[in-house]
Amino acid sequence: QSPPGKPEIHKCRSPDKETFTCWWNPGSDGGLPTNYSLTYSKEGEKNTYECPDYKTSGPNSCFFSKQYTSIWKIYIITVNATNEMGSSTSDPLYVDVTYIVEPEPPRNLTLEVKQLKDKKTYLWVKWLPPTITDVKTGWFTMEYEIRLKSEEADEWEIHFTGHQTQFKVFDLYPGQKYLVQTRCKPDHGYWSRWGQEKSIEIPNDFTLKD
């Protein structure tokens, strides 16, 4: 039996700059029941506070609802582990909510096979920004990637589309079924997870419908 090992704050992420969650890795418990508490202060302020919500985001996490989330403030976050034999504190993590955004994936992915005047066939991929994103006001600007592969292929082919919410994919094989997904990243944040997979079959005898 021994004091607990040093916990490590794994990551903090926000879906929208309005709320955020931090997760930690506990470290060893020293063979004893161990309690974990997350405390935080804001840079330039004296007060230290305890995590407002240990439940919403699951085990070893702290959820900061709107009420507890400030942008343009640096949070200094630590996790403390305590058992009968002693305690241990993580290294502090400095968090600026503006820089930890991991949005929801883009939505309304649509796939359409089209043809140019020269009869060249292409797949037109279109999507919309994630619901929470207020793109027009500049609160968020998103960059996007799409990935696609034929059902038989092992590797995805990735296309960066910048801020465009549509993309044309050329050189596809007729008769093949293709899977497509999109993801997005805000200016200062992280890529979202890949969104829901959509599929489409490229017709063998594609002719443009009027």
């Epitope: 793109v135 027009k136 500049g138 600007t141 998103m142 960059e143 990637e145 082919e157 990735i158 960066f160 589309t161 910048g162 801020h163 465009q164 993309f167 044309k168 200016d187």
Partner: antibody, heavy 120, light 107 residues
Framework: EVQLVQSGAEVKKPGASVKVSCKAS????????IHWVRQAPGQGLEWIGY????????GYNQKFKSRATLTVDNSTSTAYMELRSLRSDDTAVYYC?????????????WGQGTTVTVSS | DIQMTQSPSSLSASVGDRVTITCRAS??????LAWYQQKPGKPPKLLVY???TLAEGVPSRFSGSGSGTDFTLTISSLQPEDFATYYC?????????FGQGTKLEIK
């Protein structure tokens, strides 16, 4: 005919700012990205950033992010690149270029270039 | 950031020669490579994008190939107007970066 016409040469002192304009014609301005690239005397090409006029989305080379601002005026189909806190090594020809309508990063039409000289 | 390395940095050749310029990316960029030609005092001109697609109005003596990390630009039969500096550029994801250039001179 697609054309990108840039503003004239500028001479600036160190620490000053410069704003270069790029007026587009011959295509739908909001459908294509506008890139900014610079070339120091006798040197290669260096990408500064791009803007998508459709939603004002921008992407920057980290090297310029704190000093460069890209904007557009859709009513006049004009893109702008402002560079602040100028240093002598910012002396270069600055180009605007249109991004291909599908692939973001390749540049199919270029402005004639604007020479910016930074000297005390 | 993805680094682009061109070789050679300069090259002397004669009219009618077949010339190859290579470009290597520091990581996989799939087929996201463009080639530009630049003459003194002029802006660059797009020759090839997506590694092998010729831009509009570019003569067929120019061709591009490669994918992943290794790419080439080939001029099958040099013409007097082809003497210029050539740049490769990846257009895979930001930041887009250029090679250092290859100056093609008359022998």
């Amino acid at each position: 005919e697609v054309q990108l016409v840039q503003s004239g040469a500028e001479v600036k002192k160190p620490g000053a700012s410069v704003k270069v304009s790029c007026k587009a014609s011959g295509y739908t301005f909001t459908d294509y990205n506008i890139h900014w690239v610079r070339q120091a005397p006798g040197q290669g090409l260096e990408w500064i950033g791009y803007i998508y006029p459709n939603n004002d989305g921008t992407g920057y080379n980290q090297k310029f992010k704190s000093r460069a601002t890209l904007t557009v005026d859709n009513s006049t189909s004009t893109a702008y690149m402002e560079l602040r806190s100028l240093r002598s090594d910012d002396t270069a020809v600055y180009y605007c270029a249109r991004g291909d309508g599908n692939y973001v990063g390749d540049m199919d039409y270029w402005g004639q270039g604007t020479t910016v000289t930074v000297s005390s | 950031d993805i680094q682009m390395t061109q070789s050679p940095s300069s090259l002397s050749a004669s009219v009618g020669d077949r010339v190859t310029i290579t470009c290597r990316a520091s990581e996989n960029i799939y087929s996201y490579l463009a080639w530009y030609q630049q003459k003194p005092g002029k802006p660059p001109k797009l020759l090839v994008y997506n590694a092998k697609t010729l831009a509009e109005g570019v003569p067929s003596r120019f061709s591009g190939s490669g994918s992943g990390t290794d790419f080439t630009l080939t001029i099958s039969s040099l013409q007097p107007e082809d003497f210029a500096t050539y740049y490769c550029q990846h257009h895979y994801a930001t930041p887009f970066t250029f090679g250092q250039g290859t100056k093609l001179e008359i022998k």
